[in-house]
Structures are given as structure tokens and as C-alpha cells.
């Protein structure tokens, strides 16, 4: 079993602590909480991603952290397993890969971490508010499910109701605190040369004393100005679900996978590379991000365009465990 | 203030299965983890699962007794958090609270929703 204090050199971003600022004495105790409690938990990550370039396409990965050998991966939408899920493919380490419509291609990415992309129109083709889940059977640890779906921010083109979203992201605050101190500086340079214009010029004279120039003071927004801030997330249509695919389900024994060829079963040692979206560049917030990082206990995310997300063949680790009883 | 609602709990035949949702209200701006605990009588509330979302990437984490039967999911739009239960056995019976925890720490509990399985 592993415990979470392991954690890799990079993550996928996790949420900035932006509510820790003041709490720097409650955020230890939860850091520590969270590894006693969480050690010997295995955690599963999904990721979800609606290619920009065409909207009905997919990309989901999986990956699970936990010291046990994988013996088998189950993708699945519409829902976990046992609750009307669709199969959409199965990745076993040495009898290949299985997969059907609108997969397009499933694949290793790690050891622990599979790939797969989706596209399709019309009836089976995937959309914005569509769960997609995915269940690791190891050994000895047994088997583990988890689903994910798109952000809601990821959604285009759908109606924003004026309803806060569930989370007022690190990067938003960021751009607002410096839009606001921009925006503090200019009035107080407009203040100052209004009085500068009214005021009579003044004589020259030798002062022994130079008068201290006025420091505009930066401001970062409040608890309560983020509070009040409303970021619209967009609505989600529920009419959509997945086309049951219930023939193409592997109802047999192991004998589907004999028509695989062998190299399907090839697993990667070490990470692959995932650069089909760059990272953005998270520009001068980045040091204030790290920052609460720093103060919980965690490694800060990525911090520039040019990284690999996962050079640790394990995939993602979160550091932040379960729920800790107060 | 946040208000935690369970509901979904009752009473099943070992074997069987149930779905606990979980709907959060109130000020949920900052929140980041939802999870399910569960108390069954004369024990201490123990944990079942969390789910946190980052981005677009979703972590989900289980106790060790869950060993697969249960799946734990979520729809972060909407504020709501499942708990699948399948293959429920008798030790399975407790009351199953739903809880979220905000980015400053801050703890809130829902009033339960009572899960019976009978063998």
C-alpha cells in the first residue's frame, strides 16, 4: 500500500488553497490529518477534456494510484458499472486493448494510466454533461471506479445562468487582483494630477528634506469581495445520454482478445508524452499559487508552458486525502 | 452557510444495491471536496470515499472496505455527489453522511440518510 506523502516532482493542476491565506494554523493540522488518514487508500484520477478543434471529440484519462500490479481497466459513460454504464473499451496489460463506438483509440499511457479518445456524431457521439468512469482491477487491492465529466467551465456555447459556480478559481482571483491594483493605480495617478493641475506651482526652493513620495497600496481581493464575485458556469442539458451498446459488450470468456495482435499489449514504461494541449503559462499569479501551496503542505502545480505533466510513470498524485472529521 | 441534503437511503436485500445522492446549496464558491462517511449504531463514523475536482481532472479516493463495490461520483455543476453501493451486505446498515469541506477548511455535515440491509 502506498501513502499520499509520496508525491511526484509535477501534478495536474490542483486547486489553489485561495480560502487558506488566513487559516495558515488550521491548513497543518488538515495536511496532517489528511496522510494519516488517507494512507494506505488507493486513489483513482479522471481526467476529462473536450478537444477545442472539434466539439464531439474526447479525450478521458485514467489512472490509479496504488502500489498493486493492474490486471484490467473498464471504460465506461453514461454512468459507473453498475448503474447503466456503457462499456466503451477494456485494456488488459497482455491480452491488448478491446474497444467500441465512439472510441477511436484506447491505449497504455503508464503503467498505472490509460488514454482514450472519443468522437463520434449523432446518436453515439458524447456530450458536454456525459460522465465517463473508469475501473481499475488490481491485485492485491482489489477493484476500484471512478468517474469524471467536464468542468463546468468547459462547456461552449451553452446559456450561463446567474447562479455562482462551486468554485472561484486560484487563476480567476489572480487576473482580478491585478486588474483591480491596475485599476487602483490609475485612478490614483488621475487623483494626482487633478490635484497637481489645481494646485499653484509651487517655488523652487532647496528642501532638506525630500517629501516621500505617495506609495499607491496593492490590494488583493478580500473573502468578501471573492465572495461576491459571480463566475456563470454554463447549464447542462440532461437529455443527452449515450447510445446503448449493449451488442458490443464482451459477454464471452477471454477468447475476444485472441484476435489482437500482440503488440496491442505493450505497455509503456515510463510516461508518454501529452502534448496535445499545451499548458498555459499562469504568468505572475503563478508565485502567489506556489505560495499557498507552500503554506499547506503541497507541491505547487505547473508553472510554465514547457513541462511535461506527469514525469512520475505513476501519473498524478493528490496530496489532499479524504474528508478529516472536525 | 452551506446545506448538505442526502437522500436515496432505505432498505435492501443483501446483494442489493442503492444510490445516495448528496445536493449542496448555500455558498459553494469555494468548495473542493465532497465525501460520504458512515456511522452504524454504537460505532465511531468512519470514512467511505471523497471525490475532489481540479480542473479537469476529478480524484476520487475510498476506504479499503469499499473494495470496489461502491462507486462514488459526482456532477460538479450541479453541486451533487452519488454514492453507488453495490453487492451491500448487512455490515453495510448505517446512517451515511454526506460532507463537504471548502477551501478555507471549513467543515459542513449533512443530517444523514439512513441505509438498512437485511440478509
Known amino acids: 500500500m502506498r501513502t499520499e506523502a509520496q508525491v511526484p516532482a509535477l501534478q495536474p493542476p490542483e486547486p489553489g488553497l485561495e480560502g487558506a491565506m488566513g487559516h495558515r494554523t488550521l491548513v497543518l493540522p488538515w495536511v496532517l490529518l489528511t496522510l494519516c488518514v488517507t494512507a494506505g487508500t488507493p486513489e483513482v484520477w479522471v481526467q476529462v477534456r473536450m478537444e477545442a478543434t472539434e466539439l464531439s471529440s474526447f479525450t478521458i484519462r485514467c489512472g490509479f494510484l496504488g502500489s498493486g500490479s493492474i490486471s484490467l481497466v473498464t471504460v465506461s459513460w453514461g454512468g459507473p458499472n453498475g448503474a447503466g454504464g456503457t462499456t466503451l473499451a477494456v485494456l488488459h496489460p497482455e491480452r491488448g486493448i478491446r474497444q467500441w463506438a465512439p472510441a477511436r483509440q484506447a491505449r497504455w499511457e503508464t503503467q498505472s494510466s490509460i488514454s482514450l479518445i472519443l468522437e463520434g456524431s449523432g446518436a453515439s457521439s458524447p456530450c458536454a454533461n456525459t460522465t465517463f468512469c473508469c475501473k481499475f482491477a488490481s491485485f492485491p487491492e482489489g477493484s476500484w471506479e471512478a468517474c469524471g465529466s467536464l468542468p463546468p467551465s468547459s462547456d461552449p456555447g451553452l446559456s450561463a445562468p446567474p447562479t455562482p459556480a462551486p468554485i472561484l478559481r486560484a487563476d480567476l482571483a489572480g487576473i482580478l487582483g491585478v486588474s483591480g491594483v491596475l485599476l487602483f493605480g490609475c485612478v490614483y495617478l488621475l487623483h494626482l494630477l487633478r490635484r497637481h493641475k489645481h494646485r499653484p506651482a509651487p517655488r523652487l526652493q532647496p528642501s532638506r528634506t525630500s517629501p516621500q513620495a505617495p506609495r499607491a497600496r496593492a490590494w488583493a481581493p478580500s473573502q468578501a469581495s471573492q465572495a461576491a464575485l459571480h463566475v456563470p458556469y454554463a447549464t447542462i442539458n440532461t437529455s443527452c445520454r449515450p447510445a446503448t451498446l449493449d451488442t458490443a459488450h464482451p459477454h464471452g470468456g477471454p477468447s475476444w482478445w485472441a484476435s489482437l495482435p500482440t503488440h496491442a499489449a505493450h505497455r509503456p514504461q515510463g510516461p508518454a508524452a501529452w502534448a496535445s494541449t499545451p499548458i498555459p503559462a499562469r504568468g505572475s499569479f503563478v508565485s502567489v499559487e506556489n505560495g499557498l501551496y507552500a503554506q499547506a503542505g503541497e507541491r505547487p502545480p505547473h508553472t510554465g508552458p514547457g513541462l511535461t505533466l506527469f514525469p512520475d510513470p505513476r501519473g498524478p498524485r493528490a496530496m489532499e486525502g479524504p474528508l478529516g472529521v472536525r | 452557510q452551506v446545506q448538505l441534503v442526502e437522500s436515496g437511503g432505505g432498505l435492501v436485500q443483501s446483494g442489493g444495491s442503492l444510490r445516495l445522492s448528496c445536493a449542496a446549496s448555500?455558498?459553494?464558491?469555494?468548495?473542493?471536496?465532497m465525501g460520504w462517511f458512515r456511522q452504524a449504531p454504537g460505532k465511531e463514523r468512519e470514512f467511505v470515499g471523497r471525490?475532489?475536482?481540479?480542473?479537469?481532472?476529478?480524484?476520487?479516493s475510498y476506504a479499503d472496505f469499499v473494495k470496489g463495490r461502491f462507486t462514488l461520483y459526482g456532477n460538479q455543476a450541479r453541486n451533487t455527489v452519488y454514492l453507488q453501493m453495490n453487492s451491500l451486505k448487512p455490515e453495510d446498515a448505517a446512517v451515511y453522511y454526506c460532507?463537504?469541506?471548502?477551501?478555507?477548511?471549513?467543515?459542513?455535515w449533512g443530517k444523514g440518510t439512513l441505509v438498512t440491509v437485511s440478509s
Open positions: 448555500g455558498r459553494t464558491r469555494s468548495m473542493y471536496v
Open positions: 460532507n463537504l469541506r471548502r477551501l478555507d477548511g471549513v467543515n459542513y
Open positions: 471525490i475532489k475536482w481540479s480542473g479537469d481532472t476529478t480524484y476520487t
